[in-house]
Interface confidence: low
C-alpha cells in the first residue's frame, strides 16, 4: 500500500475507525447507565472526549448522544468513566437542571442532563 | 486480535474508515468543480452514495456538503462521477434551485444546487 495510506484499528466489526480510535453510534434510546452497560458489553466505554484535534470528526455529529462524562457531587468536578478529569476548554458545558450525566452534541458541546432520560449514545474503544 | 475485531482500510492518513470505505470531510468551501479536483488530487472522488446499509454513518452527518452526483441535462438523469446512475430510493432529491450538482445532507437527502456555489465537501475512497 502507498506510504500515504494506512490501516486503522483494530475495531469491532462495522465500527467507525478514525485516527486509531473506534466509534459506534447507537440508535436505540437508553438511559446513561444502560448506555454504559451496552458499551461495556462490547468491550468499549461511552465516548470520552480527550482531543479536539484527534477527534475532529465529532464536529460533524448531529443530534445528542450520551457520553461517558459524569458529575461527581462530592467535589463538584466532571470526570470520565476511567476516572480522569475533564480537561479545560475541551467541551462547552451547558448545565440543564438537576443532572449528573452529559450528552455530547455537535461542535464539542456537553449538555448536562438527568441520567435517567433515554437517549442515543456513542461507544468508543481506544486502540493501543 | 479478537475474531470480532478487524482492521479497516487502507485509507489516506487521518481519513475516516467505515466498512472498508474511506471518507474525509473538508471544511474549506469550494465550488463543485474545485471540490472534485481536490478529491481527485488525493486519489479519491466526491462522495458516492451506493448503500444505506454500508454507509449508515452518513445518517449522522450534520450540515451539507458537495457529493459526486451531477445532473445530465440531455437525458434528465442523475449520475455519479464514475458514470453510474443514481439508484432509486437511495436519496431523497430536493430541488432548492436550478442546478446540476448535488449537496449531501443528513439522513440521505440530496439538495440540488448551482455547481458554482462554494460549499464544504466529502471525499471518498473505496478500498478494494
Amino acid at each position: 500500500i502507498p506510504l500515504t495510506e494506512s490501516y486503522c484499528g483494530p475495531c469491532p466489526k462495522n465500527w467507525i475507525c478514525y485516527k486509531n480510535n473506534c466509534y459506534q453510534f447507537f440508535n436505540e434510546s437508553k438511559n446513561w447507565y444502560e448506555s454504559q452497560a451496552s458499551c461495556m458489553s462490547q468491550n468499549a466505554s461511552l465516548l470520552k472526549v480527550y482531543s479536539k484535534e484527534d477527534q475532529d470528526l465529532l464536529k460533524l455529529v448531529k443530534s445528542y448522544h450520551w457520553m461517558g462524562l459524569v458529575h461527581i457531587p462530592t467535589n463538584g468536578s466532571w470526570q470520565w468513566e476511567d476516572g480522569s478529569i475533564l480537561s479545560p476548554n475541551l467541551l462547552t458545558i451547558i448545565e440543564m437542571q438537576k443532572g449528573d450525566c452529559a450528552l455530547y452534541a455537535s461542535s464539542f458541546k456537553g449538555y448536562i442532563e438527568n441520567c435517567s432520560i433515554p437517549n442515543t449514545y456513542i461507544c468508543m474503544q481506544r486502540t493501543v | 486480535i479478537p475474531l470480532t475485531e478487524s482492521y479497516c482500510g487502507p485509507c489516506p492518513k487521518n481519513w475516516i474508515c467505515y466498512k472498508n470505505n474511506c471518507y474525509q470531510f473538508f471544511n474549506e468551501s469550494k465550488n463543485w468543480y474545485e471540490s472534485q479536483a481536490s478529491c481527485m488530487s488525493q486519489n479519491a472522488s466526491l462522495l458516492k452514495v451506493y448503500s444505506k446499509e454500508d454507509q449508515d454513518l452518513l445518517k449522522l452527518v450534520k450540515s451539507y456538503h458537495w457529493m459526486g452526483l451531477v445532473h445530465i441535462p440531455t437525458n434528465g438523469s442523475w449520475q455519479w462521477e464514475d458514470g453510474s446512475i443514481l439508484s432509486p430510493n437511495l436519496l431523497t432529491i430536493i430541488e432548492m434551485q436550478k442546478g446540476d450538482c448535488a449537496l449531501y445532507a443528513s439522513s440521505f437527502k440530496g439538495y440540488i444546487e448551482n455547481c458554482s456555489i462554494p460549499n464544504t465537501y466529502i471525499c471518498m475512497q473505496r478500498t478494494v
Epitope: 448531529k62 443530534s63 462547552t92 458545558i93 449538555y111 442532563e113 | 439522513s107
Partner: antibody, heavy 125, light 107 residues
Framework: QVQLVQSGAEVKKPGASVKVSCKAS????????MHWVRQAPGQGLEWMGI????????SYAQKFQGRVTMTRDTSTSTVYMELSSLRSEDTAVYYC??????????????????WGKGTTVTVSS | EIVLTQSPATLSLSPGERATLSCRAS??????LAWYQQKPGQAPRLLIY???NRATGIPARFSGSGSGTDFTLTISSLEPEDFAVYYC?????????FGGGTKVEIK
C-alpha cells in the same frame, strides 16, 4: 411545515405572573430544545433560557433565575414560560425559538432556526 | 459571559450599495457565530450560521466571514427588503448571547 404558535398578548399588573405558551407542529417535538428570548420596546434580543422538551430539564439566564419557570406538555407539544414578580421593565415581546439540530437543510446546532411570532406582555399599573 | 459588540449602531445606505456590519466578541468564539435579520413587527430570521454558512433560502448577496473575535456580515448590493436590524449571536460559550444590533436604514 414547521410552526411555533404563541399565545396572545397579555396585560399584567406589577407583582403579578404571566404564562406564555408556544405550541409546536410539523416536527418531532421532543427532538429539539426550545429557547425563550425577549425583546423590550426598541431594544435588542435577550436570551432567557432553554428547555429540553424530552425530559423537561431547563437552564435559565442568571438574570431570570428564581423568577422564570419553563415547562412543557408533550401531549400537546407545547412549551410554557412563566415569569413571576413582574415589573414594568418586563414589558417586552417574548419569543420561543427552536434550536436547530442539524436535521434540516443548512441548519446547524445552537442557532434558532424557527421562531414563534412573539407574545407581547405589557406590565402596567 | 461573552459580550458581543456590534458596529456601527446605524448604517445609512442606498439601495444597490454594499453594507458591511461588524460584530466583535469579548473573547474568542471560534466560528460559532450566527447572524439574524429582524424587520419591524416580525420575529428574527436566521441568515448565517457558523460565521459563513447561509441558512435555507437566504440570497447569495448575504455573506459572513471571520473567526475568533472579529466577524463581518456583508450585503453585496442592498435590496429594498434588506433594510432591517441585524443581530449577531454566539454559541461557543454558555450562556449564548446576542449583540446589540445594527440598524440598516435607507439614506
Amino acid at each position: 411545515q414547521v410552526q411555533l404558535v404563541q399565545s396572545g398578548a397579555e396585560v399584567k399588573k406589577p407583582g403579578a405572573s404571566v404564562k406564555v405558551s408556544c405550541k409546536a407542529s410539523g416536527y418531532t417535538f421532543t427532538s429539539y430544545y426550545m429557547h425563550w428570548v425577549r425583546q423590550a420596546p426598541g431594544q435588542g434580543l435577550e436570551w432567557m433560557g432553554i428547555i429540553n422538551p424530552s425530559g423537561g430539564s431547563t437552564s435559565y439566564a442568571q438574570k431570570f433565575q428564581g423568577r422564570v419557570t419553563m415547562t412543557r406538555d408533550t401531549s400537546t407539544s407545547t412549551v410554557y414560560m412563566e415569569l413571576s414578580s413582574l415589573r414594568s421593565e418586563d414589558t417586552a415581546v417574548y419569543y420561543c425559538a427552536r434550536e436547530g439540530a442539524g436535521f434540516a437543510y443548512g441548519m446547524d446546532y445552537y442557532y434558532m432556526d424557527v421562531w414563534g411570532k412573539g407574545t407581547t406582555v405589557t406590565v402596567s399599573s | 459571559e461573552i459580550v458581543l459588540t456590534q458596529s456601527p449602531a446605524t448604517l445609512s445606505l442606498s439601495p444597490g450599495e454594499r453594507a458591511t456590519l461588524s460584530c466583535r466578541a469579548s473573547q474568542s468564539v471560534s466560528s460559532y457565530l450566527a447572524w439574524y435579520q429582524q424587520k419591524p413587527g416580525q420575529a428574527p430570521r436566521l441568515l448565517i450560521y457558523d460565521a459563513s454558512n447561509r441558512a435555507t433560502g437566504i440570497p447569495a448577496r448575504f455573506s459572513g466571514s471571520g473567526s475568533g473575535t472579529d466577524f463581518t456580515l456583508t450585503i453585496s448590493s442592498l435590496e429594498p427588503e434588506d433594510f432591517a436590524v441585524y443581530y449577531c449571536q454566539q454559541s461557543d460559550n454558555w450562556p449564548f448571547t446576542f449583540g446589540g444590533g445594527t440598524k440598516v436604514e435607507i439614506k
